[in-house]
């Protein structure tokens, strides 16, 4: 696993413990909380990152209207169960035996139940809509410049293949980034859109998961982009199953 050999750190995940005890004295890094070995040449899965976080001390309208089935992560933080590959287990339970089903980004997609609740498969989130509102600037951003900068960011910083950034919409002051990745499209070694979206969210919140600086400050053609708020919508390959009670 690639880690910075000189001082043995994980460039892509600061929530790790690293030591030169890999094969041939190579630097090896393990995620906090789970103790699982991580590949420092790519993003760590959101499941392992959440587990580590819980273990730590504290013109025409171009904007997309999220589908009625879009999920927003309202439940917040929890200590997840991850499978041996670091993915979320389909069923998550808390210490009081309350259980629920999650999608591939760990967001609840059913009502809460008890230990008898069954989650047959981990449903893939294939479409993520990142909705940003920016603060007033010297002028509106040029759409093509903004598009290029955000695509560059996801390609270079998050190592997400450009084909998975489906679109960047802009209607001042709202920016929307659409990420799409079907099960059939995701090849071995491809960064998952859920992981890229999570890293981006943490960057925007000034809680960067990368070694080094505390956050991410964007510029478009020199112009500072200061984000006012961020909303992320998740669309699953199979619509979520909530009771009507929740919908009202």
């Amino acid at each position: 696993h690639t880690a910075a050999q000189d001082n043995c750190t994980c460039p892509t995940n600061k929530m790790t413990v690293c030591s030169p005890d890999g094969p041939g004295g190579r630097c090896q890094c393990r995620a906090l909380g789970s103790g699982m070995a991580v590949d420092c040449s790519t993003l760590t899965s959101k499941c392992l990152l959440l587990k580590a976080r819980m273990s730590a001390p504290k013109n025409a309208r171009t904007l997309v209207r999220p589908s009625e089935h879009a999920l927003v992560d309202n439940d917040g933080l929890y200590d997840p169960d991850c499978d041996p590959e670091g993915r979320f287990k389909a069923r998550q339970c808390n210490q009081t035996s309350v259980c629920w089903c999650v999608n591939s980004v760990g967001v609840r997609r059913t009502d809460k139940g008890d230990l008898s609740l069954r989650c047959d498969e981990l449903v893939r989130t294939h479409h993520i809509l990142i909705d940003l509102r920016h603060r007033p600037t010297a002028g509106a951003f040029n759409h093509s410049d903004l598009d290029a900068e955000l695509r560059r960011l996801f390609r270079e910083r998050y190592r997400l293949h450009p084909k998975f950034v489906a679109a960047v919409h802009y209607e001042q002051p709202t920016i929307q980034i659409e990420l799409r990745q079907n099960t059939s499209q995701k090849a071995a070694g491809d960064v998952d859109i859920g992981d890229a979206a999570y890293y981006f969210e943490r960057d925007i919140k000034g809680e960067s998961l990368f070694q080094g600086r505390g956050g991410l400050d964007l510029r478009v053609r020199g112009e500072p982009l200061q984000v006012e708020r961020t909303l992320i919508y998740y669309l699953d390959e199979i619509p979520p199953k909530f009771s009507m009670k929740r919908l009202t």
């Epitope: 603060r135 010297a138 002028g139 000034g206 600086r213 956050g215 053609r221 020199g222 112009e223």
Partner: antibody, heavy 119, light 106 residues
Framework: QVQLVQSGAEVKKPGASVKVSCKAS????????IHWVKQKPGQGLEWIGY????????KYNEKFKGRVTITRDTSASTAYMELSSLRSEDTAVYYC????????????WGQGTLVTVSS | DIQMTQSPSSLSASVGDRVTITCKAS??????LAWYQQKPGKAPKLLIS???SLETGVPSRFSGSGSGKDYTLTISSLQPEDFATYYC????????FGQGTKVEIK
Amino acid sequence: QVQLVQSGAEVKKPGASVKVSCKASGYTFTTYVIHWVKQKPGQGLEWIGYINPNNDGTKYNEKFKGRVTITRDTSASTAYMELSSLRSEDTAVYYCARPHFETHAMDYWGQGTLVTVSS
Amino acid sequence: DIQMTQSPSSLSASVGDRVTITCKASEDIFNRLAWYQQKPGKAPKLLISGATSLETGVPSRFSGSGSGKDYTLTISSLQPEDFATYYCQQYWNTWTFGQGTKVEIK
């Protein structure tokens, strides 16, 4: 290396205008905005506004809107801050500053220009 | 506008002392906080950005911490060259500075 060199001290009468320059070198001028910051004698720092040399866009602190104009000359890699209708409370050191390459904090500063307003 | 309240406004300390300066924002600034050092007649110098990241060439005795609205600059062992005025600055919503903390020799 990155350098911001400002024009010399100025003494002005109340009601007059002053124009302070800030010449940038050591980097591509159009890549970063140039901020202007005011510091009254013995007091703290106050953000005035910035110019984006790439497109001439400006953003001002509401407090300074109307009396401050920030401009630039890309061919000379120079930003300017003009303050009109001067009054005694405008007596201050004015700094230009460039952001950090990775954040919106101010990493490189000019040496400052003292503007004294006195009758 | 976001207000930055810095405290104390001044402090007296001796060489070798541990010094702590705090800065409170009027709202969450998501770690978009910088600390500057300014000496008389000189321009401010950036010490820390992103609340915790030490700039290149800044001695490791300086450290930044905090999150949300509350941030701290710590000088672990004060040196003679550290006597100066320190400012915090938020850059989450435009740019505003704290009032400054003057660190004087006791």
